[in-house]
Each structure stands twice: as structure tokens, then as C-alpha cells.
């Protein structure tokens, strides 16, 4: 996961820009990425990197814990 | 209307250090990121660095190695830049300006004179 | 960082004629199809005042003889017809990346 959202977020050089992805990354079990990103005030490329980082993240968590439940984990 | 409102002129010793305001209104001001500029006498525009209010998140030029501190006071909707060990090199004006979207300088103050002078 | 140069440094312009400012940037400022180049006016004692975003949008209030454009790495700041009250500096700036930076400046002198 982290591998993954450290090449996401290198691409951006604006340093905001890329903490938006990162805040995009933390757990929130409550409300979707949408749902989150609906809440940013601060400007488009900040909605785009959160959802982006918010979705990649999602998804790998999901695939994650599919993977242990076949394990038996 | 946005207004971003800076403190007045300041005349300070070398190796001293200097605080600037900027006083916005007329927004949110934990939506928008302050960014602050200097500009020699005669010379172009140089930038320092920024805050983003809302989360305290702060980048700086590498040029000012150290010496610039831009903090903010989001119950005053003020922000400021501390600027250390003074040299006379450092004599010009100081802005702050607001960016919007993460793209471009909107609104500006309306800069305040440093002059470092022994 | 990205370095932004700009030509001429000065130009003096008769009333009526075409006033025309480049910036190259040593790298380009497009991320996602998006040019992140500004350009800004100054005026003697006053900040700058922001002319165009986006390499080509005008912003509120600004009269209609301003245009910008150009991608990635060339960017032009047009102003036709030159007026008198046009005398000041240009400054290109560029958002795509910290830090931000300016170009050097041009000066326009009417003629």
C-alpha cells in the first residue's frame, strides 16, 4: 500500500497538493471517498489527489483482506 | 470583499529579526493557502514559501536556509512571516497573497517595507 | 526548481501597436493537461496584479486586450492594443510545483 501510494503521490510537486493525497490514505470506515472529498475547500487539484490516493488505497485494502479471508486468516 | 491587510513599515538592525502580519477578511480564511513574496528594490519577485491555515501545513524556499517562519492564527484570520538574522540584503517589500485553487495569486497585500540598516 | 526566463527584459511600445512578452520555463508546467502558468502586472509603489491564469484565462476585470497563451514549456503575454496607462512590469509564475517561481520581468515603456 505504501509502495503504491508513495508513486501516486511523487507525482506531485506541490506540496499541499501532495498531503491531500496522503490525508486521502488514512482509514475512515464512516463515509466514502466522495464523501470526504466533497468536504475540501481548498481547490480542485487538492479533491482530485485525495480521491485518487483515497480510491487506490481503498481498493488495496479491500483486495487485502480478500486475499487473508481465502487464507483462512 | 477579500482584503488581505499587512503591518506597517519596518526599519530593523543587522543579525535582528522581523514579524509581518497579513490580516485577511472578506473569506474563509482556513480555505485558501497564504503564500508570502519579497521584492528587492528594483529587482523581481522572489517567493518564500506559504501556509495552508486550515491544517497548519507550511513549505519554504531552501534560498532563506532556515531564517523564514510562516506561522498562522486561524481566530484572527492573521498570518505571519518571521524573518531571522536580518542582513542588509534583506532590505525590500514584503507581500502576502492569497492562492486560490492551488494555481494563482488572487489578492495581495499591500506589501510592507523592511529596511535592515545599522 | 524550475527556472522561468523571460524576453525581452524591456520594450518600449507606441499606443495602439502589439506588446508581446515570452517565458520559457526549463521545464514544462503542464500536469494533466493543465498549464499552470500566471501572469501578473505591477505598477510602481503597487503589488502585483494578476492578469492571467491557466496560460490563457483572463481574470475578472481585465480588460480584453490582455491574452496569454502557449503550453508545457513556451508561454506568450499579448497585449493589443498597447494604452498609455499599460506602463509597468510583466511577471510570468508558474503554480505546477514548489517552490513557485517568477520569471525576471519585462519592462513596458509606451513610446
Known amino acids: 500500500l505504501q509502495e503504491k501510494i508513495e508513486e501516486i503521490a511523487a507525482k506531485y510537486k506541490h506540496l499541499v497538493v501532495k498531503k491531500c493525497c496522503y490525508d486521502g490514505v488514512r482509514i475512515n470506515h464512516d463515509e466514502t471517498c466522495e464523501q470526504r472529498a466533497a468536504r475540501i475547500s481548498v481547490g480542485p487539484r487538492c479533491v482530485k489527489a485525495f480521491t485518487e490516493c483515497c480510491v487506490v488505497a481503498s481498493q488495496l485494502r479491500a483486495n487485502n483482506s480478500h486475499k487473508d479471508l481465502q487464507l483462512g486468516r | 470583499q477579500v482584503q488581505l491587510v499587512q503591518s506597517g513599515a519596518e526599519v530593523k538592525k543587522p543579525g535582528s529579526s522581523v514579524k509581518v502580519s497579513c490580516k485577511a477578511s472578506?473569506?474563509?480564511?482556513?480555505?485558501?493557502?497564504i503564500h508570502w513574496m519579497r521584492q528587492a528594490p528594483g529587482q523581481g519577485l522572489e517567493w518564500m514559501g506559504y501556509?495552508?491555515?486550515?491544517?497548519?501545513?507550511?513549505n519554504y524556499n531552501e534560498n532563506f536556509k532556515g531564517r523564514v517562519t510562516i506561522t498562522a492564527d486561524k481566530s484572527t484570520s492573521t498570518a505571519y512571516m518571521e524573518l531571522s538574522s536580518l542582513r542588509s540584503e534583506d532590505t525590500a517589500v514584503y507581500y502576502c497573497?492569497?492562492?486560490?485553487?492551488?494555481?494563482?495569486?488572487?489578492?495581495w497585500g499591500q506589501g510592507t517595507t523592511v529596511t535592515v540598516s545599522s | 526548481d524550475i527556472v522561468l526566463t523571460q524576453s525581452p527584459a524591456s520594450l518600449a511600445v507606441s499606443p495602439g501597436q502589439r506588446a508581446t512578452i515570452t517565458c520559457k520555463a526549463s521545464?514544462?508546467?503542464?500536469?494533466?493537461?493543465?498549464?499552470?502558468m500566471n501572469w501578473y502586472q505591477q505598477k510602481p509603489g503597487q503589488p502585483p496584479k494578476l492578469l492571467i491564469y491557466?496560460?490563457?484565462n483572463l481574470d475578472s476585470g481585465v480588460p480584453a486586450r490582455f491574452s496569454g497563451s502557449g503550453s508545457g514549456t513556451d508561454f506568450t503575454l499579448t497585449i493589443n492594443p498597447v494604452e498609455a496607462e499599460d506602463t509597468a512590469n510583466y511577471y510570468c509564475?508558474?503554480?505546477?510545483?514548489?517552490?513557485?517561481?517568477f520569471g525576471g520581468g519585462t519592462k513596458v515603456e509606451i513610446k
Open positions: 491557466a496560460a490563457s
Open positions: 501556509i495552508y491555515p486550515r491544517e497548519g501545513w507550511t
Open positions: 521545464q514544462s508546467v503542464d500536469f494533466e493537461g493543465f498549464n499552470y
Open positions: 497573497a492569497r492562492e486560490r485553487n492551488l494555481e494563482y495569486f488572487d489578492y
Open positions: 472578506g473569506y474563509t480564511f482556513t480555505d485558501h493557502i
Open positions: 509564475q508558474q503554480s505546477v510545483e514548489d517552490p513557485h517561481t
